[in-house]
Interface confidence: low
């Protein structure tokens, strides 16, 4: 990779080492500009493999208010608009970074965490395990 | 819900309005530790609405690499393993938050960011506008 | 630009009223799911309510639900909150915010107005 020079503006911080404590601002850059904030609004309701939309909310996280997928059927829905098991529904899942509040409570200090979070589902060929 | 008291030992904070500058350890905490590591490594191959994943690397971000799905078709797989047109697949994009180095190059401070990243894909009905 | 100004903020007595407006612009506020969220003195920030694009569905925290409404007219563009039955413990600067789902955060703030309640 390439090496690049350190901005001699930057803030002083007496530890260097990894792990460490950061300064972050918490002011969001989006860079999100160009997107259709309707961009997939309503695929939950139009996918084969539909799923609904679970708050999870906790005052300890940053952002504290996450939306998790939950898929609705075990089997993905047919051209005739029923559940066909055949195939299976399963969530699309993702590790985002998000802030917990360390130690509890406190609102200028935290500490990076990663979760696992369910963003929608989508329609597979299930696994069928053959019996000799 | 609870009011939560202020934790005596946090520590200080200059600046106690939003926006504001926070402490942030690096330090990521996992709290994914029961989840199996392959729950959805195959899912883009099993798919009706199969994807490819590829990397985006940024030095200059924190995570430095975010792995981006891209739909194979435009059109779902069906029960004979041809593509179907009269399905799309469509990419399920969330948002996330990442850190940016602000200034850049310095190793200390950060800017919260969040950017859009499309997960995996989902097979959906097509919106069809009749002409009048 | 997005543009988000809070009004309505003021000092009530407990058990009192006020009504807090989020003028908007800059963005097509039809679009976007609205919050307010709160932080009160020397403490970390609290998610209030929200409301769907079309103000059909609202969510509140435990601690205001019955006394607190979020409401929207998409056709001027504005956020609203109202908040009776006060107490103390409502004291805090309250912000409108403009967010996102799968999953929500907020990307916009505005300046905050703040609401003291005390006698």
């Known amino acids: 990779g390439i090496t690049i020079p350190r901005n001699p503006g930057c803030p002083n911080s007496e530890d260097k080492n990894f792990p460490r404590t950061v300064m972050v601002n918490l002011n969001i850059h989006n860079r999100n500009t160009n997107t259709n904030p309707k961009r997939s609004s309503d695929y939950y309701n139009r996918s084969t493999s539909p799923w609904n939309l679970h708050r999870n909310e906790d005052p300890e996280r940053y952002p504290s208010v996450i939306w998790e997928a939950k898929c609705r059927h075990l089997g993905c829905i047919n051209a005739d608009g029923n559940v066909d098991y055949h195939m299976n529904s399963v969530p699309i899942q993702q590790e985002i970074l998000v802030l917990r509040r360390e130690p509890p409570h406190c609102p200028n200090s935290f500490r990076l965490e990663k979760i696992l979070v369910s963003v929608g589902c989508t329609c597979v060929t299930p696994i069928v395990h053959h019996v000799a | 819900g609870i009011t939560i008291p202020r934790n005596p030992g946090c520590p200080n904070s200059e600046d106690k309005n939003f926006p504001r500058t926070v402490m942030v350890n690096l330090n990521i905490h996992n709290r994914n530790t029961n989840t199996n590591p392959k729950r959805s490594s195959d899912y883009y191959n099993r798919s009706t609405s199969p994807w490819n994943l590829h990397r985006n690397e940024d030095p200059e971000r924190y995570p430095s690499v975010i792995w981006e799905a891209k739909c194979r078709h435009l059109g779902c797989i069906n029960a004979d393993g041809n593509v179907d047109y009269h399905m799309n697949s469509v990419p399920i994009q969330q948002e996330i938050l990442v850190l940016r180095r602000e200034p850049p190059h310095c190793p200390n401070s950060f800017r919260l960011e969040k950017i859009l990243v499309s997960v995996g894909c989902t097979c959906v009905t097509p919106i069809v506008h009749h002409v009048a | 630009e997005v543009q988000l100004v809070e009004s309505g903020g003021g000092l009530v007595q407990p058990g009192g009223s006020l009504r807090l407006s989020c003028a908007t612009s800059?963005?097509?506020?039809?679009?976007?799911?609205m919050y307010w969220v709160r932080q009160a003195p020397g403490k970390g920030l609290e998610w209030v309510a929200e409301?769907?694009?079309?103000?059909?569905?609202?969510y509140y925290v435990d601690s205001v639900k019955g006394r607190f409404t979020i409401s929207r007219d998409n056709a001027k563009n504005s956020l609203y909150l109202q908040m009776n039955s006060l107490r103390a413990e409502d004291t805090a600067v309250y912000y409108c915010?403009?967010?996102?789902?799968?999953?929500?955060?907020?990307?916009?703030w505005g300046q905050g107005t703040l609401v003291t309640v005390s006698s």
């Open positions: 409301i769907k694009q079309d103000g059909s569905e609202k």
């Open positions: 915010a403009k967010g996102e789902i799968l999953p929500l955060y907020f990307d916009y």
């Open positions: 800059g963005f097509t506020f039809s679009s976007y799911g």
